[in-house]
Interface confidence: medium
């Protein structure tokens, strides 16, 4: 376990022409805050992928109002470090994402408005316990200067915070909940003097006078076991001075609940009971209230009457997510009827309607036949948002204005000859065929139900039906 720490030194317009004077230009007062997100590994992950190693939000910075005549000063920044606790081993390689957000404090409908000013994403290698690393990054016209480090929290030590540090005087038995125990290091610096009576086995301290408990132990002096299991007396592999095992891997092994949450097993999974001020599947989300301004993109934060109540972000159209952080693909809701094309213009949706439809959502089916007479006795048929003329015999074209040759489509079957006639067409059939279109074979023996030849045979083939 340990903490990733980020210190923002400055954020402001980068060098060069065209850089903005300040983030508040012509917008009235504003203030900045930062969000840090840590993702494991060096892969280029999607921006939406979760901050699996953790995330943190800074406090709001002081309110800043631009003075048009004055030279642009360094922007006032939030005080303090951004700290991202990590429970497991420090991965060494990680992606660091730092977002700079602007909170506009002018008269906004629904409260302050938030917008993302800059995002820098860098893949980094960093050993825990090392010195502060300094960096300067550009994001568009902005420049961000910052330092960062990862440090282990005792009793964890080492470049990945995986070794457990034991003061020379402490016994070498591991506490419950470690499976198997990490090797204990004897070469640790002398710890500070802990609170009087703090358990040497189950407690430790970083500051003089405190008593912090190892997993599995609680109480002011870390004397009270959280669960009844311990390494002693368990069946299975024997305990040694360097390690011990607890039975089988269970969902609560290693306590997946962060921030002091307690884990209880459920069928096939686990459930964390979080202390007040934290929530989430693993108690990983710190207690945020409306005062922290958690709703982005102009979302309205509605909070309960007391701190125990949840807050909720009501997002304006176009945004969603628990903090209104995601842009909605509003066209995915298919708001345009009758095959209209949806256009999301940001401030509004627009539907481009197919011919024959109108209205904001293409909901009105126009009377396609109105004023569209079909010539030469044709009748107008509506359908699919377009009109169509069903033409009288001898005429064709979109409006039945073209004289049609009824014989052009060769309507007479089996070699019959077609003659155009004022009322349509007449077929003169070849010998052996009959019907208006010469479609029926004539059989002198009267067996008209049989085909002229078996399937696949030509009439001249020797096989015959009997």
């Amino acid at each position: 376990a340990g903490v990733f720490e980020l210190q923002i030194h400055s954020f402001g317009p980068g060098p060069g022409p065209g850089a903005p004077r300040s983030p508040c230009s012509a917008r009235g007062p504003c203030r900045l805050f930062f969000r840090v997100c840590l993702k494991p590994g060096l892969s280029e992950e999607a921006a939406e992928s979760p901050c699996a190693l953790g995330a943190a939000l800074s406090a709001r910075g002081p309110v800043y109002t631009e003075q048009p005549e004055a030279p642009a000063p360094d922007l006032p920044l939030p005080n303090g470090l951004l700290q991202v606790p990590f429970r497991d081993a420090w991965p060494g390689t990680f992606s660091l994402i730092i977002e700079t957000w602007r909170e506009e404090l002018g008269d906004q409908i629904g409260g302050p408005a938030w917008s993302l000013l800059a995002r820098v994403t860098r893949r980094r290698r960093l050993a825990a316990g090392g010195p502060w690393a300094r960096d300067i990054q550009r994001a568009g016209a902005w420049e961000l200067r910052f330092s960062y480090r990862a440090r282990c929290e005792l009793p964890a030590v080492g470049t990945a915070c995986t070794r457990l540090c034991r003061p020379r005087s402490a016994p070498s038995r591991c506490g419950p909940g470690l499976r198997p125990c990490a090797p204990l290091e004897d070469e640790c610096e002398a710890p500070p003097v802990c609170r009087a009576g703090c358990s040497l086995e189950h407690g430790f301290c970083e500051q003089p006078g405190e008593c912090r408990c190892l997993e599995g132990w609680t109480g002011p002096l870390c004397m009270v076991p959280v669960s009844t299991s311990s390494c002693l007396g368990l069946r299975g592999p024997s305990s040694t001075t360097t390690g011990c095992l607890v039975p089988g891997p269970g969902p609560c092994d290693g306590n997946p609940c962060a921030n002091g949450g307690s884990c209880s097993e459920t069928p096939g999974s686990f459930e964390c009971t979080c202390p007040r001020g934290f929530y989430g599947l693993r108690c990983e989300v710190s207690g945020v209230t409306c005062a922290d301004g958690p709703c982005f993109n102009g979302g309205l934060c509605v909070g309960g009457a007391d701190p125990d109540s949840a807050y909720i972000c009501h997002c304006p159209p176009g945004f969603q997510g628990s903090n209104c952080e995601k842009r909605v693909d509003r066209c995915s809701l298919q708001p345009c009827r009758n095959g209209g094309l949806c256009l999301d213009l940001g401030h509004a949706l627009r539907c481009r309607c197919r011919a024959g439809f109108a209205g904001p959502r293409c909901e009105h089916d126009l009377d396609d036949c109105a004023g569209r007479a079909c010539a030469n006795g044709g009748t107008c048929v509506e359908g699919g948002g377009a009109h169509r003329c069903s033409c009288a015999l001898g005429f064709g074209g979109r409006n039945c204005r073209e004289r049609a040759d009824p014989c052009a489509a060769r309507p007479c079957a089996h070699g019959g000859r077609c003659y155009a006639h004022f009322s349509g067409l007449v077929c003169a059939c070849a010998p052996g065929y009959m019907g208006a279109r010469c479609e029926f074979p004539v059989h002198p023996d009267g067996v008209s139900a049989l085909p002229a030849a078996p399937p696949g045979l030509r009439p001249g083939d020797p096989q015959r039906y009997l």
Partner: antibody, heavy 118, light 107 residues
């Protein structure tokens, strides 16, 4: 399609408790807040509270804080509301409703009619 | 709590009519208002969210408008299936509150 199934009716005695269920299907149950709304006979709608299945967060109308307890069972995608110390004032239809991503109660259950009578 | 008032508790109109139902809030609610329809069998459906956005599947004859404290729902061409009680609901502040409802009947 999104469906919220509620039992049709419950008959309970004064002073007792009743646990109403709302089984969700057709969407990711753990991603949406679930609301509960009360409607007394011939009257309007009253918001009781809401619960988020993943976060476990709840928010109650102050008026119902000592009357209603909201819980969920994620494994069965079911939301529950327990009403305690029932009186005739609690005789009503109780609806569950999903809170859509744009802050509207976009799908409603059919409602459970609770009658408190000795 | 924010009080939502629907001054007209019942309203009678003819088929094909244009009907407007109004709703006022005891304080400004910045367009955070939804409209619901409750049919005689008790079924409740969302019609309009965020003052004027039509919920998917709702006929285009329904529309909403308003700002500040005053809002309205309009049915442009009344049809038989529109017989119902219509409720407005604010979500600007907890607790969420509904109007008393407007019962729409056919003349």
């Amino acid at each position: 399609q999104v469906q919220l199934q509620q039992p049709g009716a419950e008959l309970v005695k004064p002073g007792a408790s009743v646990k109403l269920s709302c089984k969700a299907s057709g969407y990711s149950f753990t991603s949406y807040w679930m609301h509960w709304v009360k409607q007394r006979p011939g009257q309007g709608l009253e918001w009781i509270g809401m619960i988020h299945p993943t976060l476990g967060d709840t928010n109650y109308n102050e008026k119902f804080k000592s009357k209603a307890t909201l819980t969920v069972d994620k494994s069965s995608s079911t939301a529950y509301m327990e009403l305690s110390s029932l009186t005739s004032e609690d005789s009503a239809v109780y609806y569950c409703a999903r809170l859509g991503s744009l802050s509207m109660m976009d799908y409603w259950g059919q409602g459970t009619s609770v009658t408190v009578s000795s | 709590d924010i009080q939502m008032t629907q001054t007209t508790s019942s309203l009678s109109a003819s088929l094909g009519d244009r009907v407007t139902i109004s709703c006022s809030a005891s304080q400004g609610i910045s367009n955070y208002l939804n409209w619901y329809q409750q049919k005689p069998d008790g079924t409740v459906k969302l019609l309009i969210y965020y003052t004027s956005s039509l919920h998917s599947g709702v006929p285009a004859r329904f529309s909403g408008s308003g700002s500040g404290t005053d809002y309205s729902l309009t049915i442009s061409n009344l049809e038989p299936e529109d017989i119902a009680i219509y409720y407005c609901q604010q979500y600007s502040k907890f607790p969420y509150t509904f109007g008393g409802g407007t019962k729409l009947e056919i003349k």
